[in-house]
Every structure is written in structure tokens, then in C-alpha cells.
């Protein structure tokens, strides 16, 4: 039994790290393998993760970690029974993939403005709580080419956009993801999307002027 692609891990920097690797051939990951991990610290327990299959030869393990600090370093040992297949280490703060933002809501009752809000997925005691910035993806349900990304480079989990920037009488969807620049993280997964109907209508004068102008052509 041989490891083809060594484990690579990412951490949500609150409680979960996910490690993935590939074996040399078809493997029943949960029956044949164990990933043992331990925080390099005075008082730390040895933990064991039972991997799941991710394809025929791929394995994935969810490592539970708690109360992370920036200096944390874990030893990782991949075992097949009594045989040590691979030994490595993992520093969560250097491989951060934030949790996805939650509770995305679109308010359409603010005059001529769409207000999108979501919640920061971290509690206030977590380092990432004040470090996240966001990207919001809005797309037309019926036209995949009508899609845009808004970068939210401030920390407030809200976005205001003019309803007039979207097509009227069309259903739109939005989703949001996060990243932490200070920890050089990857992007989080997208949040679940939320749907709304853009009922915005142009004011009459603007509408009238537009048609008058068009008539002259």
C-alpha cells in the first residue's frame, strides 16, 4: 500500500481542518487507513481521524481542532494498520480556508436600492472575525451571461446596489464568499444562494425621455 499524492490540508481556523490525499490504487479508506494528529504542545491529546473515500483511490479526513492560535503546529501520521505510510506536519494558520458566510438575505423594500446582508461565520473571539472581506456574486436566473461579482473590501457584511443596475422584471440569485487577506487564505466556499425578483421600474420621466430619444432615431 502506497501514498501517491501526499496529504494536503486546509483549516477553517475555528474547529475543522480537512486533509485530502490519493493512494496508489483503489482503497477502502475508512477500513484500511487512519490519520493520527497531535498538537505540538505540552498538554495535548493524540487524536485519530477515520478517513472517507473521495473517489476510488482518494481519501479525505476531517480533523477536529480547538482553540487555535497562530503558532499551532500539528504532527500528522498516516497509518495502514501497523505500517506508517507517511509522516508530516500541518500549520493551520498557513493554510486557511474560511467558513462560508451565512444567512444571506436580500431586502428589496429599500427605495430603488437592493440591500444584501449576511452574517460573519466566526464568533467575535476568533482572529478571523475582524479579518474577513467578501465577494458577492449576483446572476440572472435565466441568462448565465448576466452575472457579476461585487468585491466587498470593507468588513461590514452588507452590500447596497442600485436596483436599476439589474434588469427589471427578472429573477436574480446571489451568493457570497469570504477570504482573509492577512492570513493569505483561499476563498471560502460560496454560501447557499438566495433568490429575489427585481420588480424595479424606471421613473416615468426617465422612461418617457428614453422613448422620445429612441423615436428620433
Amino acid at each position: 500500500m502506497k501514498v501517491l499524492q501526499e496529504p494536503t490540508c486546509v483549516s477553517d481556523y475555528i474547529s475543522l481542518s480537512t486533509c485530502e490525499w490519493k493512494m496508489g490504487g483503489p482503497t477502502n479508506c475508512s477500513a484500511e487507513l487512519r490519520l493520527v494528529y497531535q498538537l505540538v504542545f505540552l498538554i495535548s491529546e493524540t487524536n485519530m481521524c477515520v478517513p472517507e473515500n473521495n473517489g476510488a483511490a482518494g481519501c479525505v479526513c476531517h480533523l477536529f481542532m480547538e482553540d487555535m492560535v497562530g503558532a499551532d503546529n500539528y504532527t500528522l501520521d498516516l497509518w495502514a494498520g501497523q505500517q506508517l505510510l507517511w509522516k508530516g506536519s500541518f500549520k493551520p494558520s498557513e493554510h486557511v480556508k474560511p467558513k462560508a458566510p451565512e444567512n444571506l438575505t436580500v431586502y428589496t423594500n429599500v427605495s430603488e436600492t437592493l440591500l444584501l446582508t449576511w452574517s460573519n461565520p466566526y464568533p467575535p473571539d476568533n482572529y478571523l472575525y475582524e479579518k474577513l472581506t467578501y465577494a458577492v456574486n449576483i446572476w440572472n436566473e435565466n441568462d448565465p451571461t448576466d452575472s457579476r461579482i461585487y468585491d466587498v473590501t470593507y468588513q461590514e457584511p452588507t452590500l447596497r446596489i442600485a436596483a436599476s443596475t439589474l434588469k427589471s422584471g427578472v429573477s436574480y440569485r446571489a451568493r457570497v464568499r469570504a477570504w482573509a487577506q492577512s492570513y493569505n487564505s483561499t476563498w471560502s466556499e460560496w454560501s447557499p444562494s438566495t433568490k429575489w425578483y427585481n420588480a424595479y421600474k424606471e421613473p416615468f420621466e426617465k422612461h418617457h425621455h428614453h422613448h422620445h430619444h429612441h423615436h428620433h432615431h
Epitope: 504542545f41 480547538e66 497562530g70 503558532a71 473571539d125
Partner: antibody
């Protein structure tokens, strides 16, 4: 042996500032959160705040926001707490504590007396 | 802020007899990572506090097995199966799940 050794007792006048130190030995403070806990005379324990020495990230109980400033120097393996605008209510023993992820190691406490 | 309420506030026990201290939190103290960071500390006279129990039920190393912790949700209990003279002091419960972290007001145990 794991130890947290705090600086000695202080007597300060109202309005003054005091800075207490907490030197760790037997472990690296970067591997833990360093917390501070207040104990007024004859009273219970009150959590004040904490720091992650690796990145300097601090959080405080709202009562101590603006009153306490927690810092850490990883090169000397020492955590500090500064208390400003001292008043008689600040008279207390202040404990530094390392938490990972529970308060396993406590300093001996530093008595700060505020008196005119 | 989460308020931790201990009962009783004082306790007088004959050596060899059991003792029980209750701690109630004003709201759930389950952390977002799924753990319940409920701890018990003993402060002996003239000393700094020392850890007895972490995560509700786990005894810290070196703590005698006469100490046990139990509970869930918002109700927690520390039991001493047979009190000894060295157990005197003030017992505090503590929640480390939600900022600001908070201690109970303390329970003073004395020997009859």
C-alpha cells in the same frame, strides 16, 4: 517545569498607570492564549481579556475595554497588562493565566493597590 | 453577557461526606465548534486557582477521582464523593465558550 512568574506588588496613586508583567518558562507563550483575571479583595474572579501572542490579537470584557491593555513580547516569552487611569476600584490581585484550551497554568498574582 | 450562578454560596461538610455544587448558565454555553467549555476551579486559601474539571466532565491531570463533573445545556454540577480536609477553599465554575468569558460567584467549602 511550567511556570508563570508575575512582577511584584505595586502601590499607585489615583489617575496613574501601572504595567504588570508575566514571564513564562517551560513553554512558549506563542502556543497559548494569555489571559488576565482580576480578583478584588475578598471577591470572586473576573475575566478581563486575552491575547494571542503570535499575532497580537486581543479581546476584552467590555468592562475593561479602555482600562486594560494586554500585550506580549514573544522574544522574552512575556505577557503584559497595563491598567490606566487607576481608581480605588482597581485595587485587586491580577492573575495572568495561559489557556490551551483551559486555564491550566496560573501566575502567582500581582497585588495592585490604588491609594492617595 | 452570560451569567454563571452557583449554589450554594457556602457549604460546611464533615470529612468523608459527599458535597455537591450547582452551576447554572443564563444561556447555552455550547461553543460554535460543538464543545461545551465548562470548567471548575478551586482556589485554596492564599493560593492561585487550580483547574479541577474541563469540558464539563474531564478531570485535569493529578486531580483526585473523588472529584467529578456532570451536566449539559445550562445546568452543571461538581461532586466530591468524600470530602477531605485539603478540599477547603472557594470553588468557581467558568464558561469559556462565549466572549466575555465568565466565572460563577464562587462557593466556599469548609470542613465541619
Amino acid at each position: 517545569e511550567v511556570q508563570l512568574v508575575q512582577s511584584g506588588a505595586e502601590v499607585k496613586k489615583p489617575g496613574a498607570t501601572v504595567k504588570i508583567s508575566c514571564k513564562a518558562s517551560g513553554f512558549n507563550i506563542k502556543d497559548t492564549y494569555m489571559h488576565w483575571v482580576k480578583q478584588a479583595p475578598g471577591k470572586g474572579l473576573e475575566w478581563m481579556g486575552r491575547i494571542d501572542p503570535t499575532n497580537g490579537y486581543t479581546i476584552y470584557a467590555s468592562k475593561f475595554q479602555g482600562k486594560a491593555t494586554i500585550t506580549a513580547d514573544t522574544s522574552s516569552n512575556t505577557a503584559y497588562m497595563e491598567l490606566s487611569s487607576l481608581r480605588s476600584e482597581d485595587t485587586a490581585v491580577y492573575h495572568c493565566v495561559s489557556r490551551r484550551p483551559w486555564f491550566a497554568y496560573w501566575g502567582q498574582g500581582t497585588l495592585v493597590t490604588v491609594s492617595s | 453577557d452570560i451569567v454563571m450562578t452557583q449554589t450554594p454560596l457556602s457549604l460546611s461538610v464533615t470529612p468523608g461526606q459527599p458535597a455537591s455544587i450547582s452551576c447554572r448558565s443564563s444561556q447555552s454555553i455550547v461553543h460554535s465548534n460543538g464543545n461545551t467549555y465548562l470548567e471548575w476551579y478551586l482556589q485554596k486559601p492564599g493560593q492561585s486557582p487550580q483547574l479541577l474539571i474541563y469540558k464539563v466532565t474531564n478531570r485535569f491531570s493529578g486531580v483526585p477521582d473523588r472529584f467529578s463533573g456532570s451536566g449539559s445545556g445550562t445546568d452543571f454540577t461538581l461532586k466530591i464523593s468524600r470530602v477531605e480536609a485539603e478540599d477547603v477553599g472557594v470553588y468557581y465554575c467558568f464558561q469559556g465558550s462565549h466572549v466575555p468569558y465568565t466565572f460563577g460567584q464562587g462557593t466556599k467549602l469548609e470542613i465541619k
